[in-house]
Interface confidence: low
Amino acid sequence: EPPTACREKQYLINSQCCSLCQPGQKLVSDCTEFTETECLPCSESEFLDTWNRETRCHQHKYCDPNLGLRVQQKGTSETDTICTCEEGLHCMSESCESCVPHRSCLPGFGVKQIATGVSDTICEPCPVGFFSNVSSAFEKCRPWTSCETKDLVVQQAGTNKTDVVCGPQDRQR
């Protein structure tokens, strides 16, 4: 009686079980009563990553330099190419199909976490006692100058965007 199900790494066709092609190979012809499944290796720029009955291999992903991408790991006949972003850019999404420049933290905000190839800059507002007067993807909030340690007094209060201004103490006569 013809089988209705096949073992692992086999598939059912024309009422018989044929072997699947191994990763890195594509199907050329199904098995018959007398012949084995015929498979062929994927070409240099292609891959198949599972036991399969595909008649075409998948094209390796192209890490398009126009989109700020570069090859992180070259593809093989069994694996796809892995792309990553060039310096100064990070992936738009998990699939990393394109990249965007890291954002800068505006004045009044400092860098909480520097960007990586897969995550953007994380900014945080400068708390009281700290400031940032630059737009930067690297600078943290800096503490206000301590006038007292310089034997000076605060002449102008600091803000989240400006440092305090220190000046000499008024001498009492």
Partner: antibody
Framework: QVQLVQSGAEVKKPGASVKVSCKAS????????VNWVRQAPGQRLEWMGL????????TYNQKFKGRVTLTIDKSASTAYMELSSLRSEDTAVYYC?????????????WGQGTLVTVSS | EIVMTQSPATLSVSPGERATLSCKAS??????VAWYQQKPGQAPRLLIY???DRRTGIPARFSGSGSGTEFTLTISSLQSEDFAVYYC?????????FGQGTKVEIK
């Protein structure tokens, strides 16, 4: 609103070159790809190539066989397209078009177009 | 290069009616298709990208569908301002290629 402003119409003789400029207002080009597309009278749109201002990389439509050169002046937020060895069939409206990296080819913003007429 | 073929060349529709435009790719372009609208003397305007994502500010009457080699732009209820030429673009492979356009005219 983002605007791309292109240089004015040009009339050129066969064999000459033309350089069309495309200035971005509101934003600088960094983070955007700039595509150039042309349209001959009554014809479909034709992609000529693109430049990524971030890294200066270019990709061209091989149909133009080295006749097209794309450049960018980031400090002036201006992109340029130069087409050399002009022939009568290059008579067309030339557009610059720009888009954010997340969707690099489906262009959100277009210049008004520059008509280039090639005639002896 | 990938050839994009649009049909019909001209579509005559009455205002308020539905319009269905087709675009076929000569090979698999997955979902890397955008649709543009162009009016005489104007630059193209992006309507749909990645086959079905509507650009911000584009009315909901415009919708896109399809993947692989067959794509459709549907305008659910045509308004007077929708009469124009529509182009599909594939951006799966270089060179990027446009269809020849479908002219939507008033019946």
């Amino acid at each position: 609103q983002v605007q791309l402003v292109q240089s004015g119409a040009e009339v050129k003789k066969p064999g000459a070159s033309v350089k069309v400029s495309c200035k971005a207002s509101v934003y600088s080009f960094t983070g955007y790809t700039v595509n150039w597309v042309r349209q001959a009278p009554g014809q479909r749109l034709e992609w000529m190539g693109l430049i990524n201002p971030y890294n200066g990389r270019t990709t061209y439509n091989q149909k133009f066989k080295g006749r097209v050169t794309l450049t960018i002046d980031k400090s002036a937020s201006t992109a340029y397209m130069e087409l050399s060895s002009l022939r009568s069939e290059d008579t067309a409206v030339y557009y610059c078009a720009s888009s954010y990296y997340s969707n690099p080819y489906a262009n959100d913003y277009w210049g008004q177009g520059t008509l280039v007429t090639v005639s002896s | 290069e990938i050839v994009m073929t649009q049909s019909p060349a001209t579509l005559s529709v009455s205002p308020g009616e539905r319009a269905t435009l087709s675009c076929k790719a000569s090979q698999n372009v997955h979902t890397r298709v955008a649709w543009y609208q162009q009016k005489p003397g104007q630059a193209p305007r992006l309507l749909i990208y990645l086959a079905s994502d509507r650009r911000t500010g584009i009315p909901a009457r415009f919708s896109g569908s399809g993947s692989g080699t067959e794509f459709t732009l549907t305008i659910s209820s045509l308004q007077s301002e929708d009469f124009a030429v529509y182009y599909c673009l594939q951006h799966w492979n270089y060179p990027l290629t446009f269809g020849q356009g479908t002219k939507v005219e008033i019946k």
